[in-house]
């Protein structure tokens, strides 16, 4: 084993960690569990304990990112560098970053949890044998109802264990139809659809109607994603395999390496490769998040690489199902922290432990039996509203900070950022925010802590906006942007990723500009921004005073409220209304007195 120069280590034993964001490759519960198990390897042999927290002052901050992701060590796309970690210390020291251009799994292919069947929700086992053939993705073979299923062991023929894969024919998510499956074909805006669609949405989410006519019934749900058959590379990256598909006149109902000399599995993304030539690579075994995390956490605790090839801290990834820690790893970590203390002898307990609840029984039966139950669904909203997302990571009621005069929004001279979110005005300042609903005698509520509702964010924000269709929240601070969908966060990402050059130091505001489009402001300049593509059109760059004559040129925040544009400078705002394509200043006022209706005392 090797330790870092000067035996860098944590000087306390109760280590905290924060999972800042997630990969889409695995269910969140699986990611949480992989990290917890990885920490448990190290706590089992040392006096260290690991506690999950939900704030950035955790010792170890865990983040998924791609390419340039906010430190000086960019990731390199798929394969190669899988993750990296910093040695113990304050700030970014001790943090662990995982390359989200990898396929994260548990080392044996994509993790696809099943429903119903007879496997108690176990994940698919890829590849699996059915009727003597090998399958590397869910299949509809053996069924007449088109429901995709998989075996949860290596051999369905011998073990008979199966479950149904995520499928819109089985259930939908969120939406307003209680999780009912899609109804195909269905009518939307007078047109007939026989598959999930993104039509009518600007955020790329696939949805369907759960009755034959959306126009009449307005019932819909979002289609589950199928990690097992989402292709990479080829000419259809991100699309789904279509089974069966025709290749050189022959039908394939699973991924194949036919026609390739390198043995890599591929599939067509339409039913006929011969005519459409659309294809991509099928997911590979992926990298075990558990094993890679265990290795990275070794670095985060102070271990350098080992020269022992069997050790977890050896610098090459190797999938193993055995105990990951080698004696060399144990010796190394104990060199830094000592062994785990022997537990105190304890008298036998006299209370009878409560039995855990029995597992709920899923409908059973072989793959030819249609499941008899339907899952329940999440929050509602029309197709244009987007998935509302799970609750925020913080407390269920936002923490109110003890009040002092500066905590009264009416005493704030200049807010960092203001945004209309939902039907309320949110006002941000120094790690806090207030909410305001217009009405006679209403006052701003708060302050609340930004970190409780949006834990990934910095204290100081430059601007915030909500994209109404997808309910995505964009938070800008300096050269970085965070995008929240419910409680899940993408970021921080650099402004370069939005197509804004290095000369753009910050985004000072945003206004809606048509369906799925925004105007982004930075000082005297503005750009048209496509929310779905998350990219500005570089050719759209314009001077603010050309489009909005009469507003100050040194505004520090631009926001939209009640369909009007507000340009803030110092304590004042310039309100702009649009009439027949003309933008005209129709009011100048104080943010506190005129918008928040603060008393003028």
């Amino acid at each position: 084993f090797q330790t870092f120069e000067g035996d860098l280590k944590w000087h306390h034993h109760n280590i905290t960690y924060w999972i800042q964001n997630y990969s889409e490759d695995l269910p969140r519960a699986v990611i949480d569990d992989a990290f917890a198990r990885a920490f448990a390897l190290w706590s089992a042999v040392t006096p260290l304990t690991f506690t999950r927290v939900y704030s950035r002052d955790a010792d170890i901050v865990i983040q998924f990112g791609v390419a340039e992701h906010g430190d000086g060590y960019p990731f390199d796309g798929k394969d190669g560098l899988l993750a990296h970690a910093f040695p113990p210390g304050p700030g970014i020291q001790g943090d662990a970053h995982f390359d989200d251009d990898e396929l994260w799994s548990l080392g044996k292919g994509v993790v696809v949890p099943t429903r119903f069947g007879n496997a108690d929700g176990a994940a698919c086992h890829f590849p699996f044998i059915f009727e003597g053939r090998s399958y590397s993705a869910c299949t509809t073979d053996g069924r007449s109802d088109g429901l995709p299923w998989c075996s949860t062991t290596a051999n369905y023929d011998t073990d008979d264990r199966f479950g149904f894969c995520p499928s819109e024919r089985l259930y939908t998510q969120d939406g307003n139809a209680d999780g009912k499956p899609c109804q195909f074909p269905f009518i939307f805006q007078g047109q007939s659809y026989s598959a999930c669609t993104t039509d009518g949405r600007s955020d790329g989410y696939r949805w369907c109607a759960t009755t034959a006519n959306y126009d009449r019934d307005k019932l819909f749900g979002f289609c589950p994603t199928r990690a097992d058959s989402t292709v990479m590379g080829g000419n259809s990256a991100g699309e789904l395999c279509v089974f069966p598909f025709t290749f050189l006149g022959k039908e394939y109902s699973t991924c194949t390496s036919e026609g390739r000399g390198d043995g890599r599995l591929w599939c067509a993304t339409t039913s006929n490769f011969d005519s459409d030539k659309k294809w991509g690579f099928c997911p590979d075994q992926g990298y075990s998040l558990f094993l890679v995390a265990a290795h990275e956490f070794g670095h985060a605790l102070g271990l350098d690489h080992s020269s022992v090839p069997e050790a977890l801290m050896y610098p090459m990834y190797r999938f193993t199902e055995g105990p990951p820690l080698h004696k060399d790893d144990v010796n190394g970590i104990r060199h830094l922290y000592g062994p785990r203390p022997e537990p105190e002898p304890r008298p036998p307990t006299t209370t009878t432990p409560q039995p855990t609840a029995p597992p709920t029984v899923c409908p059973t039966g072989p793959p030819t039996v249609h499941p008899s139950e339907r899952p329940t669904a999440g929050p509602t909203g029309p197709p244009s509203a987007g998935p509302t997302g799970p609750p925020t990571a913080g407390p269920s009621t936002a923490t109110t900070v003890p009040l002092s005069p500066v905590d009264d929004a009416c005493n704030v001279n200049i807010f960092d950022a203001i945004a209309e979110i939902g039907n309320q005005l949110y006002l941000f300042k120094d790690g806090k925010y207030w909410r305001f609903s217009e009405g006679r005698g209403s006052r701003p509520q708060g302050p609340f802590l930004i970190a409780d509702k949006w834990p990934a964010l910095p204290r100081k924000l430059d601007s915030v906006f909500e994209e109404r269709l997808s309910k995505k929240l964009f938070f800008f601070s300096g050269r970085q942007v965070w995008v929240y969908t419910g409680a899940s966060v993408l970021g921080p990402r650099r402004l370069d990723k939005l197509g804004l050059g290095a000369d753009v130091a910050q985004v000072t505001g945003a206004l809606r500009s048509g369906r799925g489009k925004m105007l982004l402001f930075s000082g005297r300049r503005l750009w048209r921004f496509d929310v779905k593509a998350q990219m500005v059109d570089p050719r759209s760059a314009s001077e603010v005073d050309r489009m909005f004559p009469g507003v100050p040129l040194d505004t520090h925040d631009v926001f939209q409220y009640r369909e009007k544009a507000y340009f803030c400078q110092d304590r004042f705002y310039w309100r702009v209304s649009s009439r027949s394509e003309l933008n005209q200043v129709d009011q100048v006022g104080y943010v506190t007195y005129d918008i928040l209706q603060c008393p003028e005392d």
Epitope: G72, P74, D76, G77, H84, H299
Partner: antibody, heavy 124, light 107 residues
Framework: EVQLLESGGGLVQPGGSLRLSCAAS???????SMWWVRQAPGKGLEWVS?????????FYADSVKGRFTISRDNSKNTLYLQMNSLRAEDTAVYYC?????????????????WGQGTLVTVSS | DIQMTQSPATLSLSPGERATLSCRAS??????LAWYQQKPGQAPRLLIY???YRATGIPARFSGSGSGTDFTLTISSLEPEDYAVYYC?????????FGQGTRLEIK
């Protein structure tokens, strides 16, 4: 003893091309990221490009993007920089440098070994 | 990109004196800072990495300190061979950037 030896510099006309090489010895070349850093006459240091240990990832300074290509041959312990569409402002001493950090352990920021440099002059 | 500003541009001191060179980053870079020494006609030489760790073979009179945005290179007692140009370099954020250099000359 770690050694880095650059070659391939010289006088070239604007729009021309040159290929620089850097022969490495004394360390496990295939484990480390390698960099090209340049220094215009009488000026400071400017990073040009980096290639990760496996050669699977390359990054470039904005000033050379699209014109320069970094590559490596781990079997020959050699780093390369192919320079096309050269401009007068590319005139500099070009150094290859070894990263102190390696693989997934990040920290130990710094370039612990440098070559002696090779002069590239772009002039008509 | 993060701007690295070194001061002073030139420092004139006599042998035996203490030299203090400053490097300031335009935003926090944690401790991801290195110092290099460059003599005329030679390649740069790593002195300090991660703000405060002396590189192999560097005399104990060289020390580095600081974190976040403000960093210092100190030479406790100048030797004749220490007169050179000194550069700081950050890797707290991508891309890496160098300071413009401080020339240390004999008074």
């Amino acid at each position: 003893e770690v050694q880095l030896l650059e070659s391939g510099g010289g006088l070239v006309q604007p729009g021309g091309s040159l290929r620089l090489s850097c022969a490495a010895s004394g360390f496990t070349f295939s484990q480390y990221s390698m960099w090209w850093v340049r220094q215009a006459p009488g000026k400071g240091l400017e990073w040009v490009s980096v290639i990760y240990s496996s050669g699977g990832a390359t990054f470039y300074a904005d000033s050379v993007k699209g014109r320069f290509t970094i590559s490596r041959d781990n079997s020959k312990n050699t780093l390369y920089l192919q320079m096309n569409s050269l401009r007068a402002e590319d005139t500099a001493v070009y150094y290859c440098a070894k990263d102190r950090a390696y693989g997934d352990y990040v920290g130990w920021n710094g370039f612990d070994y440098w070559g002696q440099g090779t002069l590239v002059t772009v002039s008509s | 990109d993060i701007q690295m500003t070194q001061s002073p541009a030139t420092l004139s001191l006599s042998p035996g004196e203490r030299a203090t060179l400053s490097c300031r980053a335009s935003q926090s870079i944690s401790s991801f800072l290195a110092w290099y020494q460059q003599k005329p006609g030679q390649a740069p030489r790593l002195l300090i990495y991660d703000a405060s760790y002396r590189a192999t073979g560097i005399p104990a009179r060289f020390s580095g300190s600081g974190s976040g945005t403000d960093f210092t290179l100190t030479i406790s007692s100048l030797e004749p061979e220490d007169y050179a140009v000194y550069y700081c370099q950050q890797r707290g954020n991508w891309p890496i950037t160098f300071g413009q250099g401080t020339r240390l000359e004999i008074k």
